[in-house]
């Protein structure tokens, strides 16, 4: 199973990116550092493309020191970040309103710490179930063109409904290859019989799964990372097959419409 | 070599301040929380708290007001003053690392603090 | 406020014998909790965090898992060395935190 998380300048999950059998589950988060190696083709997360600059103002990257991206996070309140509960570290850094995943200074980011990271409490590591975590930030953020939250939605996703999914993860598998700047990759949410014949026992209601039939999906890195559906936050990048983008085996995301009132009442009890 | 190094003195009196340091080699402070960690003799461990590179710190609900954890700016050392001790702060203290996923992976040898007049 | 009772207080074993250890949180703590092993003298030893993930060089028969409240560490077979005591420690949450660690299981030589 890929967790879509990484670490130190290579997959750095449960199953090292030269370790893990094809065909098995992973999740989606990993390690693009400074000096990670970038893609220069057209092939985007999994063949997604360069997002327009300042579309994706609530899109969050949770550092590791120096400047290593582990997972991707969302900005839902002026204080406080959606990612995914397997993306959890006890030191970490939040950069918002940065384009490239290189560290030079952009004018529009804004950096922060994580005071108080919660995840949700039906999370059980390794698995997949409940997997989502609350950031409480250090301060407010200053809302700019590039710095935003997003609204999560309460509806639940509906099979067909199109989807934007973005990040800066692996833009190949099993090869790691990290992009220059942050990737937009357009999906459709899948039936959750679909989902469930691509990962038989593996799927319930906290999950739902989206993709297409060309070989696009996000990958190690995009972890905790946003899916926006009709310009609100639908889910969150949760795991996947390994390698990425095989046909018939979709990314999986966290289905946040489950999740609302967790969310709001964690975000009251500890504001 | 990754090492802590807890020191300070064996002895404190009743209302006195306990202050010890830990002394960190072999990793940079600036990538670790820290722990501090107490053993009264014969009973179990207690959490004192945690401080992290940013300076943001968490307490043991007991410790808040008398204890405070601190880090000096070259990030070589890591301290603990616990104020208005009794003889129940009589134990061993430890300082540890956390190994970024909620485990502490590298402890000091410790060191015993008794307190008495 | 989230408490660690761990069960039992001891127990008697032999070399060869597998022994499970018992750590109850008070609320759900998710995955995150870790287990040490501590001798006489010395400082603890982590050997489990995440719940069920072995730390760096520990010995493949030590095991755990669990998940929400309940948590088990597990020694399929009791080595000489084993013999010592074994301390539970959430990393949930630090608010409003009287102490992480449970209250410690001693193992001794039945």
């Known amino acids: 199973v890929t967790e879509h998380v990484l670490a130190n300048n290579d997959v750095s999950c449960d199953h090292p990116s030269n370790t893990v059998p094809s065909g098995s589950n992973q999740d989606l988060g990993a390690g693009a550092g400074e000096d990670a190696r970038s893609d220069d083709s057209s092939s985007r997360i999994i063949n997604g493309s360069d997002c327009d600059m300042h579309t994706q103002p609530w899109q969050a990257a949770l550092l590791l020191r120096p400047n290593q991206l582990y997972c991707g996070a969302v900005l839902v309140h002026p204080q406080w970040l959606l990612t995914a509960a397997h993306c959890r570290k006890k030191v970490f850094r939040v950069r918002l309103g940065h384009y490239s995943l290189s560290p030079v200074y952009e004018s529009g980011q804004q950096m922060f710490q994580g005071v108080k990271s919660i995840p949700h409490p039906g999370y059980s590591h390794p698995g997949h179930s409940n997997d989502l975590m609350l950031i409480k930030l250090n301060r407010r953020i200053r809302p700019t063109k590039d710095v935003r939250p997003i609204n999560v939605s309460s509806h639940c996703p509906s099979a067909g409904t199109k989807c934007l999914v973005s990040g800066w993860g692996t833009t190949k598998s099993p090869q790691v290859h990290f992009p220059k700047v942050l990737q937009c990759l357009n999906i459709s949410v899948l039936s959750q019989k679909r989902c469930e014949d691509a990962y038989p026992r593996q799927i319930d209601d906290t999950m739902f799964c989206a993709g297409d039939k060309a070989g696009r999906d996000s990958c190690q890195g995009d972890s905790g990372g946003p899916v926006v559906c009709n310009g609100s936050l639908q889910g969150l990048v949760s795991w996947g097959d390994y390698p990425c983008a095989r046909p018939n085996r979709p990314g999986v995301y966290t289905n946040l419409c489950k999740f609302t009132k967790w969310i709001q009442e964690t975000i009251q009890a500890n504001s | 070599e990754v090492q802590l190094q807890e020191s300070g003195p064996g002895l404190v009196k009743p209302s006195g301040t306990l202050s010890l340091t830990c002394a960190v080699s072999?990793?940079?402070?600036?990538?670790?929380?820290m722990s501090w960690v107490r053993q009264p003799p014969g009973k179990g461990l207690e959490w004192i708290g945690d401080?992290?590179?940013?300076?943001?710190?968490d307490y043991a609900s007991w410790a808040k007001g008398r204890v405070t954890i601190s880090q000096d700016s070259s990030k070589t050392q890591v301290s603990l003053k616990l104020s208005s001790v009794t003889a129940a702060d009589t134990a061993v203290y430890y300082c540890?690392?956390?190994?970024?996923?909620?485990?502490?992976?590298?402890w000091g040898q410790g060191t015993l603090v008794t307190v008495s007049s | 406020a989230i408490d660690m009772t761990q069960s039992p207080s001891s127990l008697s074993a032999s070399v060869g014998d597998r022994v499970t250890i018992t750590c109850q949180a008070s609320q759900s703590i998710s995955s995150w909790l870790a287990w040490y092993q501590q001798k006489p003298g010395k400082a603890p030893k982590l050997l489990i965090y995440l719940a069920s993930t072995l730390a760096s060089g520990v010995p493949s028969r030590f095991s755990g898992s669990g998940s929400g409240t309940d948590f088990t560490l597990t020694i399929s077979s009791l080595q000489p060395e084993d013999f010592a005591t074994y301390y539970c420690?959430?990393?949930?949450?630090?608010?409003?935190?009287?102490?992480?660690f449970g209250g410690g299981t001693k193992v001794e030589i039945k």
């Open positions: 072999g990793f940079p402070l600036s990538n670790y929380a």
């Open positions: 420690q959430q990393g949930y949450t630090n608010s409003n935190i009287i102490n992480t």
């Open positions: 540890a690392r956390d190994n970024n996923d909620y485990g502490l992976d590298i």
């Open positions: 401080i992290y590179p940013s300076d943001i710190i």
